[in-house]
């Protein structure tokens, strides 16, 4: 066996138990807890990467995880792991989280083109004009997450599961 | 079009090795993991092991452990199948597989006949 | 390991007979139950994948039913290119486990 069987920190992982999606690609099955952006393949009997599968059909697995790499690649918007959604930073520029500072304060530099409202915001007729509170609050904090079918699971590294049958 | 060509049949002695090729083309070879699996006369298909597409791990079934190996070569698309100390039950077809991701292996090889016999 | 048993083990049929091969598993496998078809000297080719979704390519007389341990492959009209041996695969855990065939002869 090469590459595959070993533990990050060498030691039998406390998350190594049989669990039951409520939904998602497998159900059922026996699962591993996996690293961050990687999902467990029951037939493989391992954590893949998901990048590996975000070019083909079958990425309902990691759907989050892939729709989170294609926004990150489109300029001005972040992905946003609650709302599980594609947020454009201009809809939110004034009230927007730190994924969209650099977006925003370059918009704010320069008021050309800004829509009416952000104009506004920018002469100071809106309050918490730059105040990151609200549904965005600690947005930044979150991780991809490890599993569509357990939204928002983050886990430890010696809580990730590279322990195979 | 996607396709997995195979190296041509063997004859072999019991207790000597062989490896079997499976040269991918139609897709990118380091997308997909690939299965070999096997078939003696008469038999079921079995599960034999495979190899991961980016970084050379490989898993196998515990059956085969010890007197399998998987390689590949990125720069060939190619996948290699080597079996050890044979014997006369080793006597089978082997085929290549590709694994969708989804549960299923969507292309396989033609199969390569290995016969061993004294 | 997950088993599968696949019936009957030979089928004698004639084109244009509705032919129903099943599969059971040891075990619970919800959907993730795939056919295939393998023909003397031809690669095995995916016929089906996920219980009922066919493979690119496969005519719509192929059509597959089943949940949880019991599956069955339905071909509604036979064709000649038809004949063969029907093999099923479990694809929701490691390892992969396979039927023990289902050879289809012409009558």
């Known amino acids: 066996m090469s590459g595959l069987g070993r533990s990050r920190r060498g030691g039998r992982s406390r998350v190594d138990q049989e669990e039951r999606f409520p939904q998602g690609l497998w159900t059922g099955v026996a699962m591993r807890s996996c690293p961050e952006e990687q999902y467990w393949d029951p037939l493989l009997g391992t954590c893949m990467s998901c990048k590996t599968i975000c070019n083909h059909q079958s990425q309902r697995t990691c759907a989050a995880f892939c729709r989170s790499l294609s926004c990150r690649k489109e300029q001005g918007k972040f992905y946003d792991h609650l709302l599980r959604d594609c947020i454009s930073c201009a809809s939110i520029c004034g009230q927007h989280p730190k994924q969209c500072a650099y977006f925003c304060e370059n918009k704010l530099r320069s008021p050309v083109n800004l829509p009416p409202e952000l104009r506004r915001q920018r002469s100071g007729e809106v309050e918490n004009n730059s105040d990151n509170s609200g549904r965005y609050q600690g947005l930044e904090h979150r991780g991809s997450e490890a599993s569509p079918a357990l939204p928002g699971l983050k886990l430890s590294a010696d809580q990730v599961a590279l322990v195979y049958s | 079009q996607v396709q997995l060509v195979q190296s041509g049949a063997e004859v072999k002695k019991p207790g000597a090795s062989v490896k079997v090729s499976c040269k991918a083309s139609?897709?990118?070879?380091?997308?997909?993991?690939m299965h070999w699996v096997r078939q003696a006369p008469g038999q079921r298909l079995e599960w034999m092991g495979y190899?991961?597409?980016?970084?050379?791990?490989?898993k196998y079934s515990q059956k085969f452990q010890g007197r399998v190996t998987i390689t590949r070569d990125t720069s060939a698309s190619t996948a290699y199948m080597e079996l050890s100390s044979l014997r006369s039950e080793d006597t089978a077809v082997y085929y290549c597989?590709?694994?969708?991701?989804?549960?299923?292996?969507?292309?396989w090889g033609q199969g390569t006949t290995v016969t061993v016999s004294s | 390991d997950i088993q599968m048993t696949q019936s009957p083990s030979s089928l004698s049929a004639s084109v244009g007979d509705r032919v129903t091969i099943t599969c059971a598993a040891s075990?619970?496998?919800?959907?993730?139950l795939n056919w295939y078809q393998q023909k003397p000297g031809k690669a095995v080719k995916l016929l089906m994948r996920?219980?009922?979704r066919l493979h690119s390519g496969v005519p719509s007389r192929f059509s597959g039913s089943g949940s949880g341990t019991d599956f069955t492959l339905t071909i509604s009209s036979l064709q000649p290119e038809d004949f063969a041996t029907y093999y099923c695969?479990?694809?929701?855990?490691?390892?992969?486990?396979f039927g023990g065939g289902t050879k289809l002869e012409i009558k």
């Open positions: 597989a590709r694994y969708d991701w989804e549960g299923s292996f969507d292309y």
């Open positions: 139609g897709y990118t070879f380091t997308n997909y993991v």
């Open positions: 190899i991961l597409p980016y970084n050379d791990g490989t």
């Open positions: 075990q619970d496998i919800s959907n993730y």
């Open positions: 996920y219980t009922s």
């Open positions: 695969q479990q694809g929701n855990r490691f390892p992969p486990t």
